[in-house]
């Protein structure tokens, strides 16, 4: 019985699940395919975070291809999420900051953060892994940035956000990679690990864009995505070199990925995701 085939997953602070685009294919590069037609199509550009036009050859390619700008926006952006939610001049919090914390109807044990309107602070809670509501953040910093007031009573300065398709939580875009860095490597380095659909258990590595490291995962032997490497070295070669550090005068310098300490230390517990 395949009930017994499920693996226990342990996630610790060194291996957080990658943050997701609304759909992982939104991170794929525009692919015109091998054919020679000239067809106007649209794709989502993860660097500009906008839907853009490209010429499609008429066959093959990938799922990051849409007939219309509207369809692309619908699949890869969310108007209610991609807008800048607030600036230091706006005191309103999004409505979902006032929702009660909701663990959802499932029972994985995942540490998340919610804004407690009684204490006016972001606090930790155990999320079950499905459903719940939008007052649900992967990090304390995200929660603070979106829902807490700054020291002068204004909102914390913020940036564009993206709806996490998983649990409808708003995920600031700049948490996809640390804010000190821009990513200029292959787009698939930002996609989550994908086991694929088969039954094998092959040792592979994927690039975890949240922590900036290559991590092992079990590949099923078919399907999945391109964030899949047979060795850690191959993974690092392909993905780690894509990070470029910004320096204050706007210039860009190549860097080995040393991370500035985050403003907020995120105290992740070991999370046992029960039979997920």
């Amino acid at each position: 019985d395949s009930e017994e085939d499920e693996e226990h997953t342990i996630i610790t602070d060194t291996e957080l699940p990658p943050l997701k685009l609304m759909h992982s294919f939104c991170a794929f590069k525009a692919d015109d395919g091998p054919c020679k037609a000239i067809m106007k199509r649209f794709f989502f550009n993860i660097f500009t975070r906008q839907c853009e036009e490209f010429i499609y050859g008429g066959c093959e390619g990938n799922q990051n291809r849409f007939e219309s700008l509207e369809e692309c926006k619908k699949m890869c952006t969310r108007d209610n999420a991609n807008r800048i939610i607030k600036t230091t001049l706006q005191q309103e919090k999004p409505d979902f900051c006032f929702l009660e914390e909701d663990p959802g109807i499932c029972r994985g044990y995942i540490t998340r953060y919610f804004y407690n309107n009684q204490t006016k602070q972001c606090e930790r809670f155990k999320y079950g892994g499905c459903l719940g509501n939008m007052n649900n953040f992967e990090t304390l910093e995200e929660c603070k940035n979106i829902c807490e007031d700054g020291p002068n009573g204004f909102q914390v300065d913020n940036y564009g956000t993206q709806l996490n398709a998983v649990n409808n939580s708003l995920t600031p875009q700049s948490t996809k990679v640390p804010s000190l860095f821009e990513f200029h490597g292959p787009s698939w380095c930002l996609t989550p690990a994908d086991r694929g659909l088969c039954r094998a258990n092959e040792n592979r590595f994927y690039y975890n864009s949240v922590i900036g490291k290559c991590r092992p995962f079990k590949y099923s032997g078919c399907g999945g995505n391109e964030n899949n490497f047979t060795s850690k070295q191959e993974c690092l070669r392909a993905c780690k070199k894509g990070f470029i550090q910004r320096i204050s005068k706007g210039g860009l310098i190549k860097t080995k990925r040393k991370r500035k300490k985050q403003r907020v230390k995120i105290a992740y517990e070991e999370i046992f995701v029960k039979n997920m």
């Epitope: 395949s2 499920e6 109807i105 079950g128 459903l131 398709a165 997920m276």
Partner: antibody, heavy 123, light 112 residues
């Protein structure tokens, strides 16, 4: 073995309140590894989820927007059951109503269902 | 709401032959941990629905291994490797990625 036993009238007049009860055996309505739901089925609308309640650190509920203004699902811990109340019913609410258990721990699905109650809304 | 679309709506089958049902969701049902927020149910004639497959591909307790679920993103498939007479009924897919929980319109499997 979890069993869900439904009870309640099969005929309700328009504008009145539909009330059904689901008695649980083999599990507890207060279990933190389950959630308790009502789902209805009609030829026109297929299977339609109405709402769910669950106990974790406290009681939570979620309702379908289509019935949110009219629905209440309540637990009764003393009798180990939960109930559905749907106010201001119309003939559109005629359906087979099922209570179901959502397995929260491993299966993440409706793994036990009541026998179903055909409720007809008619004067 | 997430719309679940099943095809075909009716599937005449021959005992011993394979059968396949498709379910498409209007948005992706895959979580970061690789969990697929999709279940399959079978409602036999005159009975309540029963859980067949949970999290996209895991058979529920007591479900024969001729049933298998697969798929990811927005496209999912339920396969029966060799149909038996007792497999007749209506098959439903159901998502729990977001509220409201929604079901497909059902695929009626009947013996030819």
């Amino acid at each position: 073995q979890v069993q869900l036993q439904q009870s309640g009238p099969g005929l309700v007049k328009p504008s009145q309140t539909l009330s059904l009860t689901c008695a649980i055996s083999g599990d507890s309505v207060s279990s933190n590894s389950a959630a308790w739901s009502w789902i209805r089925q009609s030829p026109g609308r297929g299977l339609e989820w109405l709402g769910i309640i669950y106990k974790r650190s406290k009681w939570y509920n979620q309702y379908a927007v289509s019935v949110k203004s009219r629905i209440t699902i309540n637990p009764d811990t003393s009798k180990n059951q939960f109930s559905l109340q749907l106010n201001s019913v119309t003939p559109e609410d005629t359906a087979v109503y099922y209570c179901a258990r959502w397995h929260s721990d491993k299966m993440w699905g409706f793994d036990d269902w009541g026998q179903g109650t055909l409720v007809t809304v008619s004067s | 709401d997430i719309v679940m679309t099943q095809s075909p709506l009716s599937l005449p089958v021959t005992p011993g032959e394979p059968a396949s049902i498709s379910c498409r969701s209007s948005q992706s049902l895959v979580f970061s941990f690789g969990i697929t927020y999709l279940n399959w149910y079978l409602q036999k004639p005159g009975q309540s629905p029963q859980l067949l497959i949970y999290k996209g591909s895991n058979r529920a307790s007591g479900v024969p291994d001729r049933f298998s679920g697969s798929g990811s993103g927005t496209d999912f498939t339920l396969k029966i490797s060799r149909v038996e007479a007792e497999d007749v009924g209506v098959y439903y897919c159901q998502q729990y990625d977001s509220y409201p929980l929604t079901f497909g319109q059902g695929t009626k499997v009947e013996i030819k």
